[in-house]
């Protein structure tokens, strides 16, 4: 559910939401670290109803959720990391 992408493209998110989405309705989470054309970290959430939302990285619920996912993945399977380099 947790994916980290490295990209040299511009920012993907025009608007960010801090509205809580329970994990049961989340399909996957994509994290775009800042740099390479975008000055901020971006978090994109794919929901079970096929809609996509950009989440404010400062939202408490997403920080908690990512911490849980990191802890869980470090004690079991590694977090899938997909690195995409654009020349």
């Amino acid at each position: 559910v947790l994916e980290v992408y490295y990209t040299s493209l511009r920012c993907r998110c025009v608007q960010e939401s801090s509205v809580f989405i329970p994990r049961r309705f989340i399909d996957r989470i994509q994290i775009l670290p800042r740099g390479n054309g975008c000055p901020r970290k971006e978090i994109i959430v794919w929901k079970k109803n096929k809609s996509i939302v950009c989440v404010d990285p400062q939202a408490e619920w997403i920080q908690r959720m990512m911490e849980v996912l990191r802890k869980r993945s470090s004690s079991t399977l590694p977090v899938p990391v997909f690195k995409r380099k654009i020349p």
């Epitope: 509205v19 809580f20 989405i21 329970p22 994990r23 049961r24 309705f25 929901k47 079970k48 109803n49 809609s51 408490e60 619920w61 908690r64 959720m65 869980r72």
Partner: antibody, heavy 123, light 106 residues
Framework: EVQLVESGGGLVKPGGSLKLSCAAS????????MSWVRQTPEKRLEWVAT????????YYPDNVKGRFTISRDNAKNNLYLQMSHLKSEDTAMYYC????????????????WGQGTSVTVSS | DIQMTQSPSSLSASLGGKVTITCKAS??????IAWYQHKPGKGPRLLIH???TLQPGIPSRFSGSGSGRDYSFSISNLEPEDFATYYC????????FGGGTKLEIK
Amino acid sequence: EVQLVESGGGLVKPGGSLKLSCAASGFTFSSYAMSWVRQTPEKRLEWVATISDGGSDAYYPDNVKGRFTISRDNAKNNLYLQMSHLKSEDTAMYYCARDYYGSGYEDSPMDYWGQGTSVTVSS
Amino acid sequence: DIQMTQSPSSLSASLGGKVTITCKASQDINKYIAWYQHKPGKGPRLLIHYTSTLQPGIPSRFSGSGSGRDYSFSISNLEPEDFATYYCLQYDNLYTFGGGTKLEIK
């Protein structure tokens, strides 16, 4: 005291439509997601739909997707379930339930339920 | 989709006794399981969420445990009002209920 009162159930023919309502009181309705759950004649509980606190997001299981629509009116504290293309397997007791707190960060499940309204699909 | 296998489907017990109900998920549900009590003519009542967290006002005679795919729910010192049907619910990935356990008085 949290209260949820369902209405609108009844007998409908296969292929027909029905709209269920749920009147909520005793809590800040607009702050909570809401769900519909049904109990089949065999006494199995099945999740039917969930709508976010603001009404912008809705979720359904595959067996009702495209046939059922959940909606809400936060000004009236009402939850709705529009059911169309009804099948005999939709026969059940339909419950509305309060779901997660929309401004929170805790994955809590449905905590308060109404007493249900009965839907029978039969020719 | 996650399946929840609840057992037994029915059981009888004596007042003052103890019963245990189990639910097995078809995959790891990360402790996101709740337990409900259901009586005829009423809506289900939430007893426990997140495996073992009691709802406010629920007596400590009710308890839950488990992890991964396997979870259990117990009632000790059974009282007359405990005889009802109990359901588990996974809420890790959408929602799936167990088939229910009807608890009858012996």
